[in-house]
């Protein structure tokens, strides 16, 4: 998977008046990394692992960047003409990626009241707008404003892209991100399904990086894809990930099944507990 940095900023308006604050979150490699603390007006690391990325360096640069981005987005919201009464939001999501072959990608997306209305591929300078008339109107509105604003030239977008990549590379220089390996905790549980059947679930949690293989085997051989149900690989809030795989088996057949896990070159297999024993937990 590519390394990525994702900025998510939101500004709000009430009865046509743009509010002073903004919400901001930054994700590094899909993990919550930074957020903007509105009380302290500072960028704050999300959790210990994020603090470890920069060690004892300050977060001044991140604070300055987020504050500037928030200000820009507030100005953009002020120029949206069709603001009706009540609460409205403008959200900007910016993503830059560095792939294994060192190629880079960068994109920017705008949402109004949670609805996507404008996207840009920064490398190709292509803008795309969804079909709906509301999206078309909003996109025209915003693009006109961005064109008027001398700052928002092609060079500006490329500079923004370059800044994002520079920050991403700076974070990646930290061995915490590049060499971080947290092995999963794997546990197998069983639950009654229907008469004579049970559902066995294999859960992997607290692992990093995100890539993992988790599959059920019967008599040592992997079950076909369509007999297993997989959960998404999701952040668990601690800078690590979690996922699961489940399958339905006949009661009494537990001894024929194992959950196979492979992560960062390590592997383990986990049997199904029989009978009354409900959970078998292991950490390799």
């Amino acid at each position: 998977e590519p390394h990525s940095l994702r900025y998510n900023l939101t500004v709000l308006s009430w009865d046509g008046s743009v509010q002073s604050g903004f919400l901001a979150e930054v994700h590094l490699d899909g993990q919550p990394f930074l957020r903007y603390d509105r009380q302290k007006c500072r960028a704050k690391p999300q959790g210990q692992w994020a603090e470890d990325v920069l060690g004892n360096k300050t977060w001044d640069r991140e604070t300055r960047d987020l504050t500037g981005n928030g200000k820009d987005l507030r100005m953009t919201l002020a120029h949206i003409k069709d603001q009706k009464e009540g609460l409205h939001s403008l959200q900007e999501i910016r993503v830059c990626e560095i792939h294994e072959d060192n190629s880079t990608r960068s994109s920017q997306h705008f949402y109004y009241d949670g609805e996507l209305f404008l996207s840009q591929n920064v490398e190709t300078e292509e803008w795309t707008v969804p079909q709906s008339s509301r999206a078309q109107t909003l996109a025209m509105n915003v693009r006109n404003f961005l064109k008027e604003d001398a700052m928002k030239t092609k060079t500006h977008y490329h500079a923004m892209h370059a800044d994002c990549l520079q920050e991403l590379r700076r974070y990646l220089e930290s061995s915490v991100v590049l060499r971080r390996r947290v092995p999963p905790m794997v546990n197998v549980t069983r639950s009654e399904a229907s008469e004579g059947n049970i559902t066995v679930t294999c859960r992997a949690s607290s692992f990093y990086p995100r890539n993992i293989t988790l599959t059920w085997r019967q008599d040592g051989v992997s079950l076909s894809h369509d007999t297993q149900q997989w959960g998404d690989v999701l952040p668990d809030g601690n800078g690590t990930y979690q996922t699961w795989v489940a399958t339905r088996i006949c009661q009494g057949e537990e001894q024929r099944f194992t959950c196979y896990m492979e992560h960062s070159g390590n592997h383990s297999t986990h049997p199904v507990p029989s009978g009354k024993v409900l959970v078998l937990q292991s950490h390799w």
Epitope: R217, D219, V221, F257, P271, S274
Partner: antibody, heavy 118, light 107 residues
Framework: QIQLVQSGPELKKSGETVKISCKAF????????MNWVKQAPGKGLKWMGW????????TYADDFKGRFAFSLETSASTAYLQINHLKNEDTATYFC???????????WGQGTTLTVSS | DIQMTQTTSSLSASLGDRVTISCSAS??????LNWYQQKPDGTLKLLIQ???LLHSGVPSRFSGSGSGTEYSLTISNLEPEDIATYFC?????????FGGGTKLEIK
């Protein structure tokens, strides 16, 4: 730690019956099946089959159907191999081995030597 | 039944040598292969499962590889305690079948 301890050597005559035991230590007996494996003198290993220690259901390889019987005493965490109507060709060392996921023999007993004389 | 063949029934090597033991299956077994070690006193131990995955506690000088019908076990730096007979076993199909074994001796 995990251990499988088998009963001692047996000297039998043709036509007799033998019952070999395999006692498990260090794990939940009913979570793993038990395999039985035969090794004739100077020969390789031959899988005889396995018994599901949770349901008690045995599975026999084709060459071991008929005179061979797997059984359990779950309360004592013990599996048994019984061979009826013994023949000279039953002379061998018999191993029990824990059945992990029904594909792996991850822990083995020390083996029980059976000698059948005519 | 799937026949497992270990063509070399005995092998002589010196301490410190790199030794490779081979095993071939009568049909493709999709890497569903395990390796076991039997010491001269008869004690049997699992070494490798699924062609190349080392069982816990097995020294890293042991490694496994192969695909299709051809598989091998390599000991990178032969030590005195490696003197034993080595068996491969397939679990692609029932019945489970073992190779005839390769006896490793010191020169």
């Amino acid at each position: 730690q995990i251990q499988l301890v088998q009963s001692g050597p047996e000297l039998k005559k043709s036509g007799e019956t033998v019952k070999i035991s395999c006692k498990a230590f260090g794990y939940t007996f009913t979570n793993y099946g038990m395999n039985w494996v035969k090794q004739a003198p100077g020969k390789g290993l031959k899988w005889m089959g396995w018994i599901n220690t949770y349901t008690g259901e045995p599975t026999y390889a084709d060459d071991f159907k008929g005179r061979f019987a797997f059984s359990l005493e779950t309360s004592a965490s013990t599996a048994y191999l019984q061979i009826n109507h013994l023949k000279n060709e039953d002379t061998a060392t018999y191993f029990c081995a824990r059945n992990y996921g029904n594909y792996l023999f991850d822990y083995w007993g020390q083996g029980t030597t059976l000698t059948v004389s005519s | 039944d799937i026949q497992m063949t270990q063509t070399t029934s005995s092998l002589s090597a010196s301490l410190g040598d790199r030794v490779t033991i081979s095993c071939s299956a009568s049909q493709g077994i999709s890497n569903y292969l395990n390796w076991y070690q039997q010491k001269p006193d008869g004690t049997l131990k699992l070494l490798i499962q699924y062609t190349s995955l080392l069982h816990s506690g097995v020294p890293s000088r042991f490694s496994g590889s192969g695909s299709g019908t051809e598989y091998s076990l390599t000991i990178s730096n032969l030590e005195p305690e490696d003197i034993a007979t080595y068996f491969c076993q397939q679990y692609s199909k029932f019945p489970r079948t073992f190779g005839g074994g390769t006896k490793l001796e010191i020169k």
